[in-house]
């Protein structure tokens, strides 16, 4: 027959186990703490990096955006799209009509001090917002040229020139040496596209990204 | 990683926590009950057992006559 | 409610949550435990008196001789 | 070489009109640049007043807005001022200019001037 | 409108002598800045456009430097055919203002 355990070796026995059982929650529990702990101070700390990023990122356009109005994009209270105030926004741009009138090498100068760029116009839908904020008497200048006056058209922003999304007026482009472009509303055809000499000074439009904060 | 982002592994990974030490829990309970229950039946069996054992041995010893 | 909001309120839901059931968990493994070995000990008991009153009654029988 | 001439009454009594010619030779003025009237009054002090564009837009100075046009003439090449309900603060020497030389840097063309004096 | 000032108003030199014209714009022009001089009786001439380039004929004497709002003409070893008066003009914005005028005479 087995020798019985003694009741001291018996109690040592639940002892270590207690402590083992107990060591182990213990150790969970400050896993949990820490994860807890991570969950919030790092949130806080990004907060914290994401709030001063985002100063920062203001602080760039404040010389020449003193206020934007933004939006909040999606459900995420993190995500905010922003144009400077007096802009107006579609899609992923926001948009300024400049009523100064200026030729096109300084309309788009103009444009550039403002982080922005002359108008890149991708779609038809993008036209009609435009022209709701056009006046029919003026003529505004788009970021399209052909400096080399080739009839190789191209965007200030580089993006292809597409001869399918174009909104020319009819007979237009017709002049070699009138190497930029406006948008402005003839009675029969409304609003497209004309070619004049860049130095005369027209009003323009600006297009930039929107501003993520 | 973004603020949302990491608040939803965390989440994730206290959710599978509590999961696991969820079942480990029911299951240790369940065993508990289950021991319970074993080592309900196996004390009364032992006594009941017992009893009848000792009944059918004495009954046996009652009506065993030796022969004569 | 926001949703990040939203998620650090279920961090900490998840994390007391948590908390608790290890607690218990570990509660419930020691209780098991200690039951474990009171009923080791009071099985046991059962089975050494078993064994020994058997081996009483069956030597009894052996040596009671038949009246001849 | 381009070359431009005003022409036009010297005298002209307040509250009528002023009207003044800017003769353009050696240059198209539907081709290209913008046409502009410019005056110098006797303290010296320029103003540019507006302009008419080689495709016939027009541009006014805003304090001159009401009072102001610029039309032309393209089968004469000329074009022309005319400014309402003149007074004596009207009075200076009116001159023409080519625009957008230079990519619209300066007024490399001017014509030689003309003095209009508002008296009655 | 963006409004130039131009100084000094007067000025007075003799032959051979360097002088400067400043001209101070209430906004930045981005070296959109010409200088032209004038002559009693006469049209104002383009001497410099976009603020440092000089027009064809002009005498390197004239130099034109500045950004911004700040921009200034300097004549260096004045010849007497320089006396007369100077006026800087902005070609940023329509309308396109010219500074007070500075006059030049000789001693």
């Known amino acids: 027959m087995v020798p019985e355990e003694e009741p001291q070796d018996r109690e040592k026995g639940l002892w270590w186990f207690q402590l083992k059982v107990w060591s182990m929650a213990v150790v969970s529990i400050l896993l949990l703490s820490v994860c807890f702990t991570v969950s919030s101070v790092v949130p806080h700390n990004f907060m914290y990096s994401k709030t001063v990023k985002r100063l920062s990122k203001l602080r760039e356009y404040q010389q020449y955006h003193p206020s934007l109005t933004c939006v909040m994009e999606g459900k995420d209270i993190e995500d905010w799209s922003c144009c400077p105030t007096p802009w107006t926004s579609f899609q992923s741009s926001c948009y300024f009509i400049s009523t100064g009138m200026q030729s096109w090498t300084k309309s788009q100068k103009n444009c550039s001090v403002m982080g922005a760029d002359l108008v890149v116009i991708n779609t038809r839908e993008e036209q009609d917002f435009i022209i709701q904020n056009l006046k029919r008497n003026s003529s505004y200048f788009l970021g399209l040229s052909d400096p080399g006056g080739r009839r190789h058209w191209q965007w200030v922003d580089q993006t292809p020139y597409n001869e399918n999304v174009t909104f020319w007026h009819s007979g237009e482009p017709n002049n070699l040496d009138e190497r930029c472009a406006i948008i402005n509303f003839r009675s029969s055809e409304e609003w497209g596209w004309n070619d004049i000499h860049c130095h005369v000074p027209q009003k323009s439009i600006c297009k930039m990204k929107k501003i993520y904060i | 990683l973004g603020e949302p982002q990491l608040c939803y592994i965390l989440d994730a990974i206290l959710f599978l926590y509590g999961i696991v030490l969820t079942l480990l829990y029911c299951r240790l309970k369940i065993q508990v009950r289950k021991a319970a229950i074993t080592s309900y039946e196996k004390s009364d069996g032992v006594y009941t057992g017992l009893s009848t054992r000792n009944q059918e041995t004495y009954e046996t010893l009652k009506h065993e006559k030796p022969p004569q | 409610l926001g949703e990040p909001q939203l998620c650090y309120i279920l961090d900490a839901i998840l994390f007391l949550y948590g908390i608790v059931l290890t607690l218990l968990y570990c509660r419930l493994k020691i209780q098991v435990r200690k039951a474990a070995i009171t009923s080791y000990e009071k099985s046991d008991g059962v089975y050494t008196g078993l064994s020994t009153r058997n081996q009483e009654t069956y030597e009894t029988l052996k040596h009671e001789k038949p009246p001849q | 070489d381009v070359q431009l001439q005003e022409s036009g009454p010297g005298l002209v009594k307040p509250s009528q009109s002023l009207s003044l010619t800017c003769s353009v030779t050696?240059?198209?003025?539907?081709?290209?640049?913008?046409w502009n009237w410019i005056r110098q009054f006797p303290g010296n002090k320029l103003e540019c007043m507006g302009y008419?564009?080689?495709?016939?837009?027009?541009y006014y100075s805003p304090s001159l807005k009401n009072r102001i046009s610029i039309t032309r003439d393209t089968s004469k090449n000329q074009f022309f001022l005319n400014l309402n309900s003149v007074t004596t603060e009207d009075t200076a020497t009116y001159f023409c200019?080519?625009?957008?030389?230079?990519?619209?840097?300066?007024?490399?063309?001017w014509g030689q001037g003309t003095l209009v004096t508002v008296s009655a | 409108d963006i409004q130039m000032t131009q100084s000094p108003a007067s000025l007075s030199a003799s032959v051979g002598e360097t002088v400067t014209i400043t001209c101070r714009a209430s906004?930045?022009?981005?070296?959109?800045l010409a200088w032209y001089h004038q002559k009693q009786g006469k049209s104002p001439q383009l001497l410099v456009y976009?603020?440092?380039s000089l027009v064809d004929g002009v005498p390197s004497r004239f130099s034109g430097s500045g950004s911004g709002t700040q921009y200034s003409l300097r004549i260096n070893s004045l010849q007497p055919e320089d006396f007369g008066s100077y006026y800087c003009?902005?070609?940023?914005?329509?309308?396109?203002?010219f500074g007070g005028g500075t006059k030049l005479e000789i001693i």
């Open positions: 200019a080519r625009g957008g030389d230079y990519d619209d840097g300066g007024f490399a063309f």
């Open positions: 050696g240059y198209s003025i539907t081709s290209a640049y913008y």
């Open positions: 008419i564009t080689y495709d016939g837009n027009n």
């Open positions: 906004g930045n022009i981005h070296n959109y």
């Open positions: 976009n603020a440092k």
């Open positions: 003009q902005h070609f940023w914005i329509v309308p396109y203002t």
